[in-house]
């Protein structure tokens, strides 16, 4: 059976394609696909920030090659940023660490 | 209940701390901690590459700030690279796509 971390990586990949496969380039997320992915798969991250300008800003920030779409590499950078935010929260609670050094 | 992608991000964070918390700086992976993480959590990625030279090379590649340890950001870059490799494999099998465009 796959280990949790291997499963996590598989989820990252399959979630991307679940939405990138809906319209246009099937290996990229356009704005509406990104919006749907965020709303359905990352509701905790999104919170109440569902206004159009917020989505446009996020899309722009992720779209490093400026093609109006988010490719898998750009998506990975995004997930890494969220993971780093989660990690900062995690590191702020040392009692939650699995073991002290 | 957390969505699969949110769970995946949580696993990324908790797996890092499960090993970084063993010795030295509790927010970084030293070489032995990295080796243990890879062996136990990413056996499919590692395969048979368990020789010392391979580990040294991988450690060197991940350690972008050259402090002989892998911090959370460097670990995220590493996981993104693995995810991108998985994605290339995934994209190579169009019949596995959730939907054609």
């Amino acid at each position: 059976m796959a280990c949790p971390l291997e499963k996590a990586l598989d989820v990252m990949v399959s979630t991307f394609h679940k939405y990138s496969g809906k319209e246009g380039d099937k290996f990229k997320l356009n704005k509406s696909e990104l919006k749907e992915l965020l709303t359905r798969e990352l509701p905790s991250f999104l919170g109440k920030r569902t206004d159009e300008a917020a989505f446009q800003k996020l899309m722009s920030n992720l779209d490093s090659n400026r093609d109006n779409e988010v490719d898998f590499q750009e998506y990975c950078v995004f997930l890494s940023c969220i993971a780093m935010m989660c990690n900062e929260f995690f590191e702020g609670f040392p009692d939650k660490q699995p073991r002290k050094k | 209940m957390a969505c699969p992608l949110e769970k995946a991000l949580d696993v990324m964070v908790s797996t890092f701390h499960k090993y970084s918390g063993k010795e030295g700086d509790k927010f970084k992976l030293n070489k032995s901690e990295l080796k243990e993480l890879l062996t136990r959590e990413l056996p499919s990625f590692l395969g048979k590459r368990t020789d010392e030279a391979a580990f040294q090379k991988l450690m060197s590649n991940l350690d972008s700030n050259r402090d002989n340890e892998v911090d959370f950001q460097e670990y995220c870059v590493f996981l993104s690279c693995i995810a991108m490799m998985c994605n290339e494999f995934f994209e190579g099998f169009p019949d596995k796509q959730p939907r054609k465009k």
Epitope: M59, S60, N68 | -
Partner: antibody
Framework: QVQLQESGPGLVKPSQTLSLTCTVS?????????WNWIRQFPGKGLEWIGH???????NYNPSLKNRLSMSRDTSKNQFSLKLSSVTAADTAVYYC?????????????WGQGTLVTVSS | DIQMTQSPSSLSASVGDRVTITCRAS??????LNWYQQKPGKAPKLLLY???RLHSGVPSRFSGSGSGTDYTLTISSLQPEDFATYYC?????????FGGGTKVEIK
């Protein structure tokens, strides 16, 4: 109201490096925008040079890439352009612009432009 | 690079006329087409983005349409302040490229 102001020498000798700075005022020099350089040749044609944006991400026009360098100083609300080994063909009005985050990333604010002449 | 071709390169019109300028891209730019107006000695100003969306403060007599490779800028009733040069620009991919411009002159 966002304002952009280009500054730098108006005359550059051939083979030297053209250096320009753009100062942004009226809006914080935020990560939400990309900051561009565009030039307009005497014949009125417009050419995109490059931009700098989120996380310091930089994209250059491939036709100029090997001569081009862009940077930014967020503490001064400035970004700059260096174009090396200039020739008379680089004579143009140079504009700095802000690229909006809306669909198609239009250039919504422009500096007034600065004429750079390459001549000995 | 995506080539942008504008036509006509210049036109003469009178106040009140309906004016149409076309822009053709060398490949599909998926509606990521922006239009600018430039007056002599001034910087270009954004008019429309994403084919048909009016930039803030731009009069409603300006409109845009098109898809794929072919796009149009229309001025429904030309005003004295509209005599200028108009440029299209694709925002689909890098490097960004512009059309050669259309100069609208007084007849």
């Amino acid at each position: 109201q966002v304002q952009l102001q280009e500054s730098g020498p108006g005359l550059v000798k051939p083979s030297q490096t053209l250096s320009l700075t753009c100062t942004v005022s009226g809006d914080s020099f935020t990560n939400d925008y990309y900051w561009n350089w565009i030039r307009q040749f005497p014949g009125k044609g417009l050419e995109w040079i490059g931009h700098i944006g989120y996380g310091g991400n930089i994209n250059y026009n491939p036709s100029l890439k090997n001569r081009l360098s862009m940077s930014r100083d967020t503490s001064k609300n400035q970004f700059s352009l260096k174009l090396s080994s200039v020739t008379a063909a680089d004579t143009a009005v140079y504009y700095c612009t802000r690229e909006s985050f809306y669909d198609g990333y239009p250039f919504d604010y422009w500096g007034q432009g600065t004429l750079v002449t390459v001549s000995s | 690079d995506i080539q942008m071709t504008q036509s006509p390169s210049s036109l003469s019109a009178s106040v009140g006329d309906r004016v149409t300028i076309t822009c053709r891209a060398s490949q599909d730019i998926r509606n990521y087409l922006n239009w600018y107006q430039q007056k002599p000695g001034k910087a270009p100003k954004l008019l429309l983005y994403y084919t048909s969306r009016l930039h803030s403060g731009v009069p409603s007599r300006f409109s845009g349409s098109g898809s794929g490779t072919d796009y149009t800028l229309t001025i429904s009733s030309l005003q004295p302040e509209d005599f200028a040069t108009y440029y299209c620009q694709q925002g689909n991919s890098l490097p960004r490229t512009f059309g050669g411009g259309t100069k609208v002159e007084i007849k």
